[in-house]
Amino acid sequence: ILEAHYTNLKCRCSGVISTVVGLNIIDRIQVTPPGNGCPKTEVVIWTKMKKVICVNPRAKWLQRLLRHVQSKSLSSTPQAPVSKRRAA
Protein backbone atom coordinates (compact mmCIF):
# COMPACT_ATOMS: atom_id res chain seq x y z
CA ILE A 1 0.00 0.00 0.00
CA LEU A 2 1.22 3.51 -0.77
CA GLU A 3 1.76 5.52 2.40
CA ALA A 4 2.47 9.20 2.93
CA HIS A 5 5.71 9.78 4.81
CA TYR A 6 4.64 12.90 6.67
CA THR A 7 1.39 11.87 8.25
CA ASN A 8 0.59 9.82 11.33
CA LEU A 9 -3.07 9.39 10.43
CA LYS A 10 -4.39 5.85 10.67
CA CYS A 11 -7.09 6.73 8.16
CA ARG A 12 -5.81 8.06 4.87
CA CYS A 13 -8.94 9.98 3.89
CA SER A 14 -9.49 13.20 5.81
CA GLY A 15 -12.47 14.00 3.59
CA VAL A 16 -14.42 12.31 0.82
CA ILE A 17 -16.25 13.41 -2.29
CA SER A 18 -19.62 12.10 -3.40
CA THR A 19 -19.57 13.61 -6.90
CA VAL A 20 -19.40 11.13 -9.77
CA VAL A 21 -16.01 10.17 -11.17
CA GLY A 22 -16.37 8.78 -14.68
CA LEU A 23 -15.11 5.27 -15.37
CA ASN A 24 -13.27 6.58 -18.42
CA ILE A 25 -10.92 8.69 -16.29
CA ILE A 26 -10.28 6.12 -13.56
CA ASP A 27 -6.91 4.41 -13.59
CA ARG A 28 -7.06 2.49 -10.32
CA ILE A 29 -9.42 1.95 -7.40
CA GLN A 30 -8.47 0.73 -3.95
CA VAL A 31 -11.01 -0.36 -1.36
CA THR A 32 -9.59 -0.68 2.16
CA PRO A 33 -11.91 -2.26 4.75
CA PRO A 34 -11.88 -1.12 8.39
CA GLY A 35 -8.86 -2.19 10.40
CA ASN A 36 -5.42 -1.25 11.66
CA GLY A 37 -6.62 1.84 13.47
CA CYS A 38 -9.03 3.13 10.84
CA PRO A 39 -12.63 2.31 11.77
CA LYS A 40 -14.13 2.95 8.34
CA THR A 41 -14.01 1.62 4.82
CA GLU A 42 -11.93 3.85 2.59
CA VAL A 43 -12.15 4.06 -1.19
CA VAL A 44 -9.27 5.72 -3.01
CA ILE A 45 -9.37 6.42 -6.73
CA TRP A 46 -6.41 7.33 -8.92
CA THR A 47 -7.39 9.17 -12.10
CA LYS A 48 -5.68 9.28 -15.46
CA MET A 49 -5.04 12.99 -14.87
CA LYS A 50 -2.66 12.11 -12.04
CA LYS A 51 -5.00 12.88 -9.19
CA VAL A 52 -5.78 10.75 -6.17
CA ILE A 53 -9.08 11.23 -4.38
CA CYS A 54 -11.08 9.70 -1.59
CA VAL A 55 -14.64 8.76 -2.43
CA ASN A 56 -17.65 8.23 -0.21
CA PRO A 57 -17.94 4.42 0.01
CA ARG A 58 -21.73 4.75 0.30
CA ALA A 59 -22.17 6.79 -2.88
CA LYS A 60 -24.62 4.97 -5.14
CA TRP A 61 -22.63 5.73 -8.27
CA LEU A 62 -19.58 4.10 -6.68
CA GLN A 63 -21.51 0.94 -5.80
CA ARG A 64 -22.70 0.74 -9.41
CA LEU A 65 -19.19 1.38 -10.70
CA LEU A 66 -17.65 -1.30 -8.49
CA ARG A 67 -20.25 -3.83 -9.59
CA HIS A 68 -19.61 -2.88 -13.21
CA VAL A 69 -15.84 -3.20 -12.90
CA GLN A 70 -16.02 -6.48 -11.01
CA SER A 71 -18.45 -8.00 -13.50
CA LYS A 72 -16.19 -6.95 -16.38
CA SER A 73 -13.18 -8.44 -14.63
CA LEU A 74 -14.87 -11.82 -14.66
CA SER A 75 -14.95 -11.82 -18.44
CA SER A 76 -12.02 -9.60 -19.45
CA THR A 77 -9.24 -7.35 -18.21
CA PRO A 78 -10.89 -4.61 -16.17
CA GLN A 79 -10.57 -1.02 -17.33
CA ALA A 80 -9.99 0.11 -13.77
CA PRO A 81 -8.27 -2.49 -11.61
CA VAL A 82 -9.84 -2.82 -8.20
CA SER A 83 -7.73 -3.87 -5.27
CA LYS A 84 -9.11 -4.69 -1.84
CA ARG A 85 -6.41 -4.44 0.78
CA ARG A 86 -6.00 -4.00 4.46
CA ALA A 87 -4.18 -0.94 5.71
CA ALA A 88 -0.48 -1.60 6.14
Partner: antibody
Protein backbone atom coordinates in the same frame (compact mmCIF):
# COMPACT_ATOMS: atom_id res chain seq x y z
CA UNK B 1 16.16 9.56 2.91
CA UNK B 2 14.82 11.50 -0.08
CA UNK B 3 17.13 14.08 -1.66
CA UNK B 4 16.99 16.02 -4.91
CA UNK B 5 19.73 18.19 -6.38
CA UNK B 6 19.49 20.55 -9.33
CA UNK B 7 22.35 21.40 -11.67
CA UNK B 8 22.67 23.69 -14.65
CA UNK B 9 24.36 26.84 -15.88
CA UNK B 10 24.53 29.81 -13.53
CA UNK B 11 24.53 32.33 -16.37
CA UNK B 12 23.32 32.23 -19.95
CA UNK B 13 22.44 34.74 -22.64
CA UNK B 14 19.05 35.69 -24.07
CA UNK B 15 17.79 33.34 -26.83
CA UNK B 16 19.85 30.43 -25.53
CA UNK B 17 18.40 27.15 -24.24
CA UNK B 18 18.47 26.45 -20.50
CA UNK B 19 19.13 22.81 -19.65
CA UNK B 20 18.58 21.70 -16.07
CA UNK B 21 19.22 18.32 -14.47
CA UNK B 22 17.68 16.95 -11.30
CA UNK B 23 19.54 14.06 -9.69
CA UNK B 24 17.59 12.37 -6.92
CA UNK B 25 17.98 9.57 -4.42
CA UNK B 26 15.85 7.83 -1.83
CA UNK B 27 13.12 7.02 -4.34
CA UNK B 28 12.70 5.81 -7.90
CA UNK B 29 10.59 7.09 -10.76
CA UNK B 30 9.62 3.53 -11.63
CA UNK B 31 6.83 2.74 -9.15
CA UNK B 32 3.21 3.63 -9.74
CA UNK B 33 2.40 7.12 -8.49
CA UNK B 34 5.85 8.71 -8.51
CA UNK B 35 6.54 12.01 -10.18
CA UNK B 36 9.12 14.75 -10.43
CA UNK B 37 8.53 18.35 -11.36
CA UNK B 38 10.09 21.77 -11.70
CA UNK B 39 9.15 25.02 -9.97
CA UNK B 40 10.89 28.37 -10.27
CA UNK B 41 11.10 31.49 -8.14
CA UNK B 42 12.44 34.81 -9.40
CA UNK B 43 14.45 36.59 -6.73
CA UNK B 44 12.15 38.11 -4.10
CA UNK B 45 9.01 36.86 -5.86
CA UNK B 46 6.53 34.01 -5.73
CA UNK B 47 6.64 30.42 -6.93
CA UNK B 48 5.65 29.27 -10.41
CA UNK B 49 4.96 25.66 -11.31
CA UNK B 50 6.55 24.72 -14.63
CA UNK B 51 6.15 21.02 -15.39
CA UNK B 52 5.67 17.51 -14.01
CA UNK B 53 6.70 14.13 -15.35
CA UNK B 54 5.28 10.88 -13.98
CA UNK B 55 6.40 7.28 -13.72
CA UNK B 56 4.45 6.39 -16.88
CA UNK B 57 6.04 9.26 -18.86
CA UNK B 58 2.88 11.35 -18.64
CA UNK B 59 3.90 15.02 -18.86
CA UNK B 60 2.14 18.18 -17.72
CA UNK B 61 3.25 21.72 -18.56
CA UNK B 62 2.35 25.23 -17.51
CA UNK B 63 0.31 26.51 -20.49
CA UNK B 64 1.95 29.94 -20.31
CA UNK B 65 5.31 28.34 -21.18
CA UNK B 66 4.29 25.13 -22.93
CA UNK B 67 5.89 26.03 -26.27
CA UNK B 68 9.26 26.54 -24.61
CA UNK B 69 9.37 23.68 -22.08
CA UNK B 70 10.44 20.06 -22.40
CA UNK B 71 10.54 17.74 -19.42
CA UNK B 72 12.08 14.27 -19.60
CA UNK B 73 13.52 11.59 -17.36
CA UNK B 74 16.16 8.89 -17.16
CA UNK B 75 14.61 6.42 -14.74
CA UNK B 76 17.59 4.10 -14.55
CA UNK B 77 19.93 6.93 -13.52
CA UNK B 78 17.46 8.63 -11.17
CA UNK B 79 17.44 11.86 -13.13
CA UNK B 80 14.91 14.29 -14.55
CA UNK B 81 15.57 17.10 -17.00
CA UNK B 82 14.02 20.40 -18.01
CA UNK B 83 14.79 22.40 -21.13
CA UNK B 84 13.61 25.97 -21.64
CA UNK B 85 14.22 27.36 -25.10
CA UNK B 86 14.70 30.98 -26.14
CA UNK B 87 15.29 32.32 -22.64
CA UNK B 88 15.13 35.99 -21.74
CA UNK B 89 15.81 38.01 -18.61
CA UNK B 90 12.39 37.15 -17.14
CA UNK B 91 13.56 33.53 -16.91
CA UNK B 92 16.14 34.51 -14.30
CA UNK B 93 15.14 32.62 -11.16
CA UNK B 94 15.98 29.89 -8.71
CA UNK B 95 14.83 26.60 -10.23
CA UNK B 96 13.69 23.84 -7.88
CA UNK B 97 13.29 20.16 -8.57
CA UNK B 98 10.40 18.66 -6.59
CA UNK B 99 8.98 15.24 -5.91
CA UNK B 100 5.33 14.25 -5.87
CA UNK B 101 3.87 10.88 -4.95
CA UNK B 102 0.28 9.92 -5.64
CA UNK B 103 -0.49 8.64 -2.19
CA UNK B 104 -3.46 9.46 -0.02
CA UNK B 105 -3.30 11.93 1.58
CA UNK B 106 -1.71 13.55 -1.47
CA UNK B 107 0.71 16.41 -0.90
CA UNK B 108 2.20 17.60 -4.18
CA UNK B 109 5.82 18.72 -3.94
CA UNK B 110 6.53 16.97 -0.67
CA UNK B 111 10.30 17.10 -1.18
CA UNK B 112 12.32 19.93 -2.73
CA UNK B 113 15.86 20.29 -3.94
CA UNK B 114 18.04 23.14 -2.70
CA UNK B 115 17.50 25.03 -5.94
CA UNK B 116 19.85 26.33 -8.61
CA UNK B 117 20.05 30.03 -9.35
CA UNK B 118 20.02 30.90 -13.03
CA UNK B 119 20.66 34.38 -14.43
CA UNK B 120 19.88 35.37 -17.99
CA UNK B 121 21.96 38.36 -18.96
CA UNK B 122 23.46 39.83 -22.10
CA UNK C 1 -6.46 28.65 -14.93
CA UNK C 2 -7.35 28.91 -11.26
CA UNK C 3 -6.07 32.14 -9.73
CA UNK C 4 -4.96 32.18 -6.11
CA UNK C 5 -5.12 35.64 -4.57
CA UNK C 6 -2.96 35.73 -1.46
CA UNK C 7 -3.01 38.48 1.15
CA UNK C 8 -1.28 40.28 2.64
CA UNK C 9 1.84 40.33 0.49
CA UNK C 10 3.87 41.21 3.56
CA UNK C 11 3.23 41.82 7.23
CA UNK C 12 5.09 42.50 10.42
CA UNK C 13 4.03 41.06 13.75
CA UNK C 14 5.34 40.72 17.29
CA UNK C 15 6.26 37.53 19.10
CA UNK C 16 3.15 35.98 20.61
CA UNK C 17 0.82 37.62 18.08
CA UNK C 18 -1.91 35.74 16.30
CA UNK C 19 -1.26 35.92 12.57
CA UNK C 20 -3.57 35.01 9.69
CA UNK C 21 -2.75 34.76 5.99
CA UNK C 22 -5.46 34.20 3.38
CA UNK C 23 -5.68 32.75 -0.12
CA UNK C 24 -8.80 33.16 -2.21
CA UNK C 25 -9.41 30.72 -5.07
CA UNK C 26 -11.03 32.00 -8.27
CA UNK C 27 -13.08 28.79 -8.49
CA UNK C 28 -13.93 25.83 -6.28
CA UNK C 29 -10.81 23.86 -5.36
CA UNK C 30 -12.55 21.57 -2.84
CA UNK C 31 -9.81 21.77 -0.19
CA UNK C 32 -7.09 20.80 -2.70
CA UNK C 33 -4.73 23.30 -1.14
CA UNK C 34 -1.29 23.13 0.47
CA UNK C 35 0.45 25.79 2.54
CA UNK C 36 4.24 25.94 2.25
CA UNK C 37 6.70 27.67 4.56
CA UNK C 38 9.95 29.01 3.09
CA UNK C 39 12.59 30.25 5.51
CA UNK C 40 15.20 32.72 4.20
CA UNK C 41 17.66 31.04 1.86
CA UNK C 42 15.87 27.71 2.11
CA UNK C 43 13.52 25.64 -0.03
CA UNK C 44 9.79 25.56 0.74
CA UNK C 45 8.36 22.75 2.85
CA UNK C 46 4.73 21.63 3.26
CA UNK C 47 3.03 22.90 6.42
CA UNK C 48 -0.63 22.08 5.86
CA UNK C 49 -2.31 19.83 3.32
CA UNK C 50 -5.92 19.50 2.22
CA UNK C 51 -6.45 22.97 3.68
CA UNK C 52 -6.65 21.89 7.32
CA UNK C 53 -4.28 18.98 8.02
CA UNK C 54 -0.92 19.53 9.68
CA UNK C 55 2.09 17.90 8.04
CA UNK C 56 4.31 15.79 10.25
CA UNK C 57 6.54 17.73 12.61
CA UNK C 58 4.64 21.00 12.21
CA UNK C 59 3.90 22.69 15.55
CA UNK C 60 0.28 22.82 16.65
CA UNK C 61 0.30 26.62 16.70
CA UNK C 62 -0.19 26.38 12.93
CA UNK C 63 -3.68 25.71 11.65
CA UNK C 64 -5.60 25.94 8.41
CA UNK C 65 -9.24 26.52 7.70
CA UNK C 66 -11.60 27.06 4.83
CA UNK C 67 -14.56 29.39 4.46
CA UNK C 68 -16.11 28.86 1.02
CA UNK C 69 -13.43 30.02 -1.46
CA UNK C 70 -11.22 31.57 1.22
CA UNK C 71 -8.43 29.46 2.71
CA UNK C 72 -6.50 30.74 5.69
CA UNK C 73 -3.33 29.86 7.55
CA UNK C 74 -3.17 30.96 11.19
CA UNK C 75 -0.27 31.01 13.62
CA UNK C 76 -1.84 31.21 17.07
CA UNK C 77 1.21 32.57 18.88
CA UNK C 78 4.06 33.78 16.73
CA UNK C 79 7.58 32.53 17.45
CA UNK C 80 10.85 33.83 16.03
CA UNK C 81 11.38 30.68 13.97
CA UNK C 82 8.13 31.42 12.12
CA UNK C 83 9.66 34.38 10.27
CA UNK C 84 9.46 33.17 6.71
CA UNK C 85 7.59 33.41 3.43
CA UNK C 86 4.33 31.50 3.17
CA UNK C 87 2.85 30.22 -0.08
CA UNK C 88 -0.47 28.59 -0.91
CA UNK C 89 -0.83 26.12 -3.76
CA UNK C 90 -3.96 24.78 -5.41
CA UNK C 91 -3.72 21.33 -6.94
CA UNK C 92 -7.35 20.90 -7.91
CA UNK C 93 -6.42 21.02 -11.58
CA UNK C 94 -3.54 21.69 -13.90
CA UNK C 95 -1.86 24.07 -14.14
CA UNK C 96 -1.11 24.01 -10.42
CA UNK C 97 -1.02 27.63 -9.24
CA UNK C 98 0.54 29.36 -6.27
CA UNK C 99 -0.47 32.50 -4.47
CA UNK C 100 1.96 35.40 -4.75
CA UNK C 101 3.35 34.66 -1.28
CA UNK C 102 3.36 36.44 2.07
CA UNK C 103 6.53 37.67 3.75
CA UNK C 104 6.20 37.54 7.53
CA UNK C 105 8.63 39.76 9.43
CA UNK C 106 9.24 40.63 13.05
CA UNK C 107 7.89 43.98 14.21
Amino acid sequence: QVTLKESGPEILQPSQTLSLTCTFSGFSLSPYGMGVGWIRQPSGKGLEWLANIWWDDDKYYNPSLINRLTISKDTSNNQAFLKITNVDTTDSATYYCVRSELVMPYVPFDYWGQGVMVTVSS
Amino acid sequence: DIQMTQSPSSMSASLGDRVTITCQASQDIENDLVWFQQKPGRSPRPLIYYATNLANGVPSRFSGRRSESDYSLTISSLESEDMADYHCLQFKQYPYTFGAGTKLELK
